[in-house]
Interface confidence: medium
Amino acid sequence: ILGGREAEAHARPYMASVQVNGEHLCGGVLVAEQWVLSAAHCLEDAADGKVQVLLGAHSLSQPEPSKRLYDVLRAVPHPDSRPDTIDHDLLLLQLSEKATLGPAVRPLPWQRVDRDVEPGTLCDVAGWGIVSHAGRRPDRLQHVLLPVLDRATCNRRTHHDGAITQRMMCAESNRRDSCKGDSGGPLVCGGVLEGVVTSGSRVCGNRKKPGIYTRVASYAAWIDSVLA
């Protein structure tokens, strides 16, 4: 997260760290007791490493009573996701067992109504991604509030040049932005999960390249079918 600040500890109990061989790789969001939603591209970076999900964490390194690392029983990328595109960049991870819920571990309601968030709405994005262009990684969860940007503006030739589909949304990226390591994390508007940080190699914090988020409402049928 660029230009953000440290999150209040455990105030986002849905927040997950998707880890490979014990290292944070991507963000994720607990959407059901046994399921974490993340970005499909995160799996590509996992290679053959052991994928696990950390829940109940604020600090990645310090012991915390609520922290628990779960093995992954099943990884379900969206069937249409492809390595060369950010389309359908969603991944569902089934935990080896139901998460132990509590004040610091709780699923987040996700948007099912397939309607665009009003441009200008401030949405919260959180993650353990880099906090500087030099690549500094935080130990504690960071967050930032970003105004949603309308799709037409986001699709301007000088910005994303038509790449933003109806199944994606954008947020402003002027100094404050999601970045490498935040992919798969939640974009929360009004207490509801609206978007998932896409995992392309987009430049961060540059107004000309707004943040791109996969709209979960557009994938309600797929999410329901996997969770069923």
Partner: antibody
Framework: EIQLQQTGPELVKPGASVKISCKAS????????ILWVKQSHGKSLEWIGN????????SYNLKFKGKATLTVDKSSSTAYMQLNSLTSEDSAVYYC???????????WGQGTSVTVSS | DIVMTQSHKFMSTSVGDRVSITCKAS??????VAWYQQKPGQSPKLLIY???TRHTGVPDRFTGSGSGTDFTLTINNVQSEDLADYFC?????????FGGGTTLEIK
Amino acid sequence: EIQLQQTGPELVKPGASVKISCKASGYSFTDYIILWVKQSHGKSLEWIGNINPYYDYTSYNLKFKGKATLTVDKSSSTAYMQLNSLTSEDSAVYYCARSDGYYGGDYWGQGTSVTVSS
Amino acid sequence: DIVMTQSHKFMSTSVGDRVSITCKASQDVGTAVAWYQQKPGQSPKLLIYWASTRHTGVPDRFTGSGSGTDFTLTINNVQSEDLADYFCQQYSSYPWTFGGGTTLEIK
């Protein structure tokens, strides 16, 4: 020093239009949005809309859509608000303010009084 | 639209006292709330944003608190120059909306 300098008071006839300007100085104009606010009877504040000079992107309060038109001239770091088809209900003080979009207005113009009278 | 309600139109206090001005949002706005002070004949001035962060140059007598739907601006050790109208504003979602204002009177 950050300043937003607005045009002086306007006395206009019903049905006419008025264009208020807001000249920004002391900061990079395209780094911040400009918001416009109406204050009637010296009390309540109403948000009219925002314009983002970088994207040329506007957001309006539906109540003022069609009544107010927001524009900017980046070369002179000036924001404009045109008010159309004026009635006595539009008599008020109008403020422009700077905002970085992540909170309200941090610097305000001195206000422009618009009086609609025949 | 989100309605911001300042239940007290007027509040009376004495120099040196502490006063709390409240604002209630009709729905959850998180901490996306600002407070403004407007002295007679002047433009509004930003005091507090993100519910509790003081704007540059604002005396630490002014404190903001709250989240969700209930917000408070507290002025400690009230000074005569604090005579003004105080407005809350939410910027969580469009349209941005203001409270009706509270006039602080100094006895």
